[in-house]
């Protein structure tokens, strides 16, 4: 059958019918339904929501909807022994204690099972000692402290402000610096936008608000006890001492009211420069320890959380493809939340729900997609991307052979200014073409396309007249699909104006104040931005599943490969003498990129000209496109990060949220001037250039004519 026969409706009409069926009012209704109680991973409430979603997806018309369960390591506070931090005097008396819970938002005072703020997977402990303020606890902050200011964090409790980088990286850096505990806090400089009221009167963080979150350094491993394999009924589990990525020192998060009580007494060194000062009325002294009258006082942490193997549930829905049922396009987002999940994740889950409903409506009218679409409601994302990773580990053989694309669907909004897209270069043209067909929801862009408002508000730094599209990093459920399995991936959401709002994320992220009312009152009262995100995510899935030729343009990969090669070469050229001494050459990489560019160009020409009515040739060309992302996977993985296998992109070793290009070379070059054995260090740079050049060349050859 031809594609059109199989789907019964002309392709153009299909897409329009699908998009027209998406309704803002439904997304609003779904968001309300998903946010009335907490849905913490591993709890009965989240299991019940999984079953509700399973039932509703069946009603919407999917062919099958199954629960996939795993028994993974999670972390919870002790209900009878709360976590807190004290200031103690010389007699050991607690003269100040941090809060035990956040002040509940209006209307939620009587909700039970609100988990108090905690750092998931913190070990137990009651360390006491002097405090050192370490700014954002980034790699460069510890360099400043240790190398420039000669401040030793060994045996100290460090206090770091949230923002800039993933919290797990902060904890890892503190551990490496010898700290014996970490206090994380939200500074108003990063989580309180000027001119906006705090919740419930606005979308800013109140002083009692606290950001929860895991502090793992999993590097893509999934469940810490079963790295590489699914945490199923017959799994062999590591002992806790061998678990992947667990922190070794106690960690606890606090709000800025409590932080002020700790920071106002700080003595020792003054902050090195203004970039170390936040917005509290405190000196931001680095320490160590308290000033003058308070010098005999210490800080003591009381952490009693426990790690527990707990059952989690993914919901997996299938809409079978009519022509290529063995080709999978996946739309997935998580369901578990820290508390109510008003933005994270339910603003995304509500959009997925409406996309499923729209696809189901078309299916009930006799339509089917060309390829199979899988829909996923992941569990335990907040605990380290566990649900998605375990499912991908269980289904890795199918996915690596059949996975066309993965579209992520966590929070639909983190602001209401413009679109934000991170994706593989293969999807650039798909995103551009789709957004040109969608209406902008933005004020002042009535009757204009989404592409136009997006490009105006978030222009590409390289190409004029085009919007910014960012690299994929991690910190979300696409990680296993892209970084481990090499399946083309993308994500889209509405974001803030990064120029005017320098705070990190959105202010109420992972706090009790992330409610339905936050979204409905302050971010998107008409749910028009949610609808736009639904159209982008749904439209991408539709095109990927239904277009006869996969909507991937390999020439865009060629362009970025050249850009990334130039960038990494520039970094290396900061050491011209060493490059000469150790005969470091990037010729092989540039040659491979040149070859890739030429072969990609020829492939694109063939793609225009081939006989699309020949199903064998069509399948062959589509397979070359599908497997191109796969070709960038190195089966051996990156050094010390075996589950990060993509040679072109990996999460930054210094910030899990950020993507790094040519990460193997980048990490080999990082801080190379401080390495004790320069010959060995530059040898590793050369090895990484070799791996990258080989991989790019090998990927190029997958696009060559097959015979």
């Amino acid at each position: 059958k031809s594609s059109n026969e199989a789907t019964n409706i002309t392709p153009k009409h299909n897409m329009k019918a699908f998009l027209d069926e998406l309704k803002a009012e439904n997304i609003k209704k779904f968001l309300y339904n998903f946010t009335q109680i907490p849905h913490l991973a591993g709890t009965e409430q989240n299991f019940q929501l999984a079953k509700q979603i399973q039932s509703q997806w069946k009603e919407f018309g999917l062919d099958s909807v199954e629960l996939a369960h795993y028994d993974v390591l999670l972390s919870y506070p002790n209900k009878t022994h709360p976590n807190y931090i004290s200031i103690i005097n010389e007699d050991g008396n607690e003269i100040f204690n941090t809060s035990l819970f956040e002040p509940p938002p209006p209307g939620y005072e009587n909700v039970s099972d609100i988990v108090p703020p905690f750092s998931a997977f913190s070990p137990q402990g009651m360390p006491e000692g002097d405090l050192v303020y370490v700014n954002y606890a980034r790699t460069e902050d510890f360099f400043k402290l240790e190398r420039d200011m000669k401040i030793n964090c060994s045996g100290k409790i460090v206090i770091a402000r949230y923002g800039k980088v993933f919290r797990g990286n902060k904890v890892k850096n503190a551990q490496l610096a010898g700290a014996k505990g970490v206090i994380l806090y939200s500074d108003p400089a990063d989580y309180f936008a000027p001119g906006v009221k705090s919740y419930p009167d606005g979308w800013n963080l109140p002083g009692g608000g606290v950001q929860r979150g895991n502090i793992l350094n999993l590097n893509g491993a999934g469940d810490p006890l079963t790295p590489g394999y699914p945490a199923n009924e017959y799994a062999y589990r590591r002992g806790i001492a061998e678990a992947v990525g667990l922190p070794s020192i106690p960690v606890h998060p606090i709000g800025y009211y409590d932080a002020q009580k700790l920071l106002e007494k700080m003595g020792g060194s003054a902050p090195p420069d203004s970039s170390w000062r936040g917005s509290l009325k405190v000196p931001y002294n680095v320490g160590p320890g308290f000033t003058g009258n308070f010098s005999t006082q210490k800080v003591k942490m009381h952490i009693h959380s426990t790690n527990e193997v707990t059952r989690i549930y993914n919901v997996i829905g299938t809409l079978r493809g009519a022509v290529e049922p063995d080709r999978y396009v996946i739309l997935g987002g998580h369901r578990d939340s820290w508390v109510f999940g008003g933005i994270d994740p339910q603003s995304g889950a509500a959009v997925v729900h409406e996309i499923v409903r729209s696809f189901g409506t078309l299916k009930k009218e006799g339509w089917r997609p060309r390829r199979t679409i899988l829909f996923a409601s992941w569990d335990a994302e907040e605990f380290g991307l566990l649900g998605s990773t375990e499912w991908a580990e269980e289904n890795s053989r199918l996915l690596q052979e059949r996975g066309v694309a993965y579209i992520n669907a966590d929070s639909s909004i983190e602001g209401n200014y413009t679109l934000r897209v991170d994706c593989t270069p293969l999807m650039y043209s798909l995103v551009h073409n789709l957004t040109k067909e969608l209406k902008s929801p933005d004020e002042g862009f009535e009757g204009k396309s989404l592409y136009e408002s997006w490009t105006k508000k978030s222009p590409s730094p390289e190409f004029s007249g085009m919007p910014r599209i960012s690299k994929l990093g991690s910190g979300n459920d696409f990680e296993v699909f892209f970084q481990r399995l090499g399946i083309a991936s993308g994500r889209a959401r509405y974001t803030k104006n990064w120029e005017t709002n320098k705070f990190s994320g959105y202010p109420l992220y992972h706090s009790v104040y992330e409610t339905y009312e936050l979204v409905e009152k302050f971010y998107d009262p008409m749910f028009k931005y949610h609808l736009t995100v639904a159209q982008v995510r749904g439209g991408m899935v539709f095109e990927l599943a239904n277009s006869i030729v996969l909507p991937f343009d390999c020439r865009d990969y060629a362009v970025v490969l050249r850009k990334y090669a130039d960038k990494i070469y520039s970094i290396s050229m900061k050491h011209p003498q060493e490059m000469k001494t150790y005969s470091v050459s990037f010729d092989s990489l540039f040659s491979a990129v040149k070859n890739f560019t030429e072969i990609a160009s020829k492939f694109s020409e063939r793609l225009q000209d081939f006989d699309k009515s020949n199903p064998i040739v069509l399948r062959m060309m589509n397979d070359q496109l599908m497997f191109l992302e796969r070709a960038f996977i190195d089966p051996l993985g990156l050094p010390d990060r075996p589950f990060y296998r993509h040679v072109i992109y990996a999460p930054s070793s210094h910030n899990k949220y950020a993507g790094e290009s040519f990460p193997g070379i980048y990490d080999a070059l990082f801080d190379i001037e401080s390495k004790v054995d320069p010959s060995k260090a530059w040898g590793e740079v050369k090895r990484q250039i070799y791996v990258a050049a080989f991989t790019v060349q090998a990927a190029a050859e997958t696009l060559s004519e097959v015979a």
Epitope: S99, L100, F101, P206, G207, Y257, K261, E264, N293
Partner: antibody, heavy 122, light 109 residues
Framework: QVQLQESGGDVVQPGRSLRLSCAAS????????LHWVRQAPGRGLEWVTL????????YYADSVKGRFTISRDNSKNTLYLQMNSLRAEDTAVYYC???????????????WGQGTTVTVSS | SYELTQPPSVSVAPGQTARITCGGN??????VHWYQQKPGQAPVLVVY???DRPSGIPERFSGTNSGNTATLTISRAEAGDEADYYC???????????FGGGTKLTVLG
């Protein structure tokens, strides 16, 4: 509307005890720090004690430390002041007051009760 | 322990500007709050965090704070403004709330 209502004031002899209550309504009680402030006849305002919204911190004026105890029952929306070993100088109108935000330290008191009178006299 | 010093009394003609000061060591580094108390009534917050006004308080009430002095300014004074005014801070050295001694504002005439 937002209200605080003190009760329990009385005439007592020196050395005796008294418990004041402050019933709250119209706001999310468990989300705010609370104070007791007193005013002796013809005198200015004198801070007595505070409690944080979750009860984890309590601070007292030196003049009452060891004799007075502040507590709260968030399920009953009620603040308490247990006063032991009362002295003549504790004679005053006692006000309970709510802080403008959850933090009870650096921020102002935006809602006050009408006060309850405690007289310590033999 | 930390002390706040207020003038016992301030007089102002109707329609003129009254200024009530509150002195304290390096008070500019603290947040200052001001209360109005009329005879037989509970205090009312009129300015918080140095210069912010609660809803319902007229714009005529304003505050400043720097160095060793905080000031409550009442412009276009009215007879109804006649009351005792108290400044207040949190002293983090002693973990105490501190009130000033109070200033009696008289609106002449």
């Amino acid at each position: 509307q937002v209200q605080l209502q003190e009760s329990g004031g009385d005439v007592v002899q020196p050395g005796r005890s008294l418990r004041l209550s402050c019933a709250a309504s119209g706001f999310s009680f468990s989300g705010y720090g609370l104070h007791w402030v007193r005013q002796a006849p013809g005198r200015g305002l004198e801070w007595v004690t505070l409690i944080s919204y979750d009860g984890s911190n309590k601070y007292y004026a030196d003049s009452v430390k060891g004799r007075f105890t502040i507590s709260r029952d968030n399920s009953k929306n009620t603040l308490y002041l247990q006063m032991n070993s009362l002295r003549a100088e504790d004679t005053a109108v006692y006000y309970c007051a709510k802080t403008t935000v959850s933090d009870p330290y650096y921020y102002g008191m935006d809602v006050w009760g009408q006060g309850t009178t405690v007289t310590v006299s033999s | 322990s930390y002390e706040l010093t207020q003038p016992p009394s301030v007089s102002v003609a109707p329609g003129q500007t009254a200024r009530i000061t509150c002195g304290g060591n390096n008070i500019g580094s603290k947040s200052v709050h001001w209360y109005q108390q009329k005879p037989g009534q509970a205090p009312v917050l009129v300015v918080y965090d140095d210069s912010d006004r609660p809803s319902g308080i007229p714009e005529r009430f304003s505050g400043t704070n720097s160095g060793n002095t905080a000031t409550l300014t009442i412009s276009r004074a009215e007879a109804g403004d006649e009351a005792d005014y108290y400044c207040q801070v949190w002293d983090s050295s002693s973990d105490h709330v501190v009130f000033g001694g109070g200033t009696k504002l008289t609106v002449l005439g």
